[in-house]
Interface confidence: medium
Amino acid sequence: SERCDDWGLDTMRQIQVFEDEPARIKCPLFEHFLKFNYSTAHSAGLTLIWYWTRQDRDLEEPINFRLPENRISKEKDVLWFRPTLLNDTGNYTCMLRNTTYCSKVAFPLEVVQKDSCFNSPMKLPVHKLYIEYGIQRITCPNVDGYFPSSVKPTITWYMGCYKIQNFNNVIPEGMNLSFLIALISNNGNYTCVVTYPENGRTFHLTRTLTVKVVGSPKNAVPPVIHSPNDHVVYEKEPGEELLIPCTVYFSFLMDSRNEVWWTIDGKKPDDITIDVTINESISHSRTEDETRTQILSIKKVTSEDLKRSYVCHARSAKGEVAKAAKVKQKVPAPRYTVELACGFGAT
């Protein structure tokens, strides 16, 4: 049997499309696996073949391209559904081959149903808007290539179930939806419905995305270390447990990596011999500002440990900060009998 480079089932590209709507799906080979495009492959005499495995079946079968009204068709490296049906769900394979070369990849396609308010099991893309930042826009996604530029579709925008018209700070502008000044109250799911004609038929494309209003870069500050601070002293006796929380506030910053770490006498805890554990927790505000807490714990602290320097460090795209914890050994209470004896002039 001839060898074929099989890239397996590409679950990273879990494609979801709505029932009874057009869908155009590009063969992932050219986008993610091969170093050449479809045109190059075609001119080199390679042929692109499509087949599929129905949901809950093991049998690979050819795709029927002879359905009424060309419901499923192929154009270059694109598989078209005009429109999809629920039972089109399955794993689809595109194979590029000639007599000496073969490469193929499979991907899952799920046809999902939506209700009248656009609720569905569809995984929604998230678009982040900065709070109170001036005019920002979202664009109706993934509608390129469905109709030629000569066709003027109608676009209707919804927030949740409600058609957007006469909203205070949200204005539909064709394919774009403009937010004059984004507020927390603008959080939610927004849907654009694009309606266009094709060969005497009318098609609808439904695209829903989640808008999340996040902290504005105008308000962003370097990390703020809330603890340790100058107002708290960790006074311990040898043998006691030492617990020091490092709590840091990070402003939301798009694509910023927030880091918190402890050093003990200038070294990372992993690089020293003390039996130290560090537990981290993270919480977020409504605008995705982040509070990270790392609790440094030494179960049975020694007098040596109490002389060490414990410093919490934090870093974001806005800068780096550090703060030392005030750790000291508890002075033992004076022994009563000795005090009494001294008080009475004993030698």
Epitope: V221, V224, S227, N229, H231, V232, L243, P245, Y249, S251
Partner: antibody, heavy 123, light 112 residues
Amino acid sequence: QVQLVQSGAEVKKPGASVKVSCKASGYIFITYWMNWVRQAPGQGLEWMGQIFPASGTTYYAQKFQGRVTMTRDTSTSTVYMELSSLRSEDTAVYYCARTDFYRYDGGYALDYWGQGTLVTVSS
Amino acid sequence: DIQMTQSPSSLSASVGDRVTITCRASQSVSTSGYSSMHWYQQKPGKAPKLLIYYASDLESGVPSRFSGSGSGTDFTLTISSLQPEDFATYYCHHSWGIPMYTFGQGTKLEIK
């Protein structure tokens, strides 16, 4: 969710002491300051002091210095407020309240409160 | 210690009214970028509830008819359109400088 549950009402004689507890749940207990605020009948709110559970560090309002002791038990996520040498004017509802930190280094608000404990001082 | 003067001490208003409560601190409770002034609502027999923190930030879950403003020494709590559930006592609270917190004496908002 964050909850602060306080101990029940107390009746005490003048000169006695009272110890009120506040059990915290739903957050990392040791990382937030806990405050005590009291309210005499028909009066306003009066801040008494605060404790940082991780270290046991305390700050007391001048008025209560020497009479109030705040402690914590990290194993049960509970803070305690003990007020000694009670007098009739200490009759009040005593609240524990968590201090949250928002984006700034200092100047924090009290974001969660216990349900309050009524302490009555009467001979 | 910073003293807080809240006014008025009581106020009668009707549902739908716009209401303003002010709080004056004896010294500034602001620094670059923020003010350590907070507002609470308290209903009879209940614990206070945080409404506004840092002078103007609305606490999560609090209706947007509540707003706060001011900096330095003078601060305002505004209720844009009074609702029946808003009749309560309101307190301002400063937390400037650790570790001394003080509250205003309260404003009792009653139905006219």
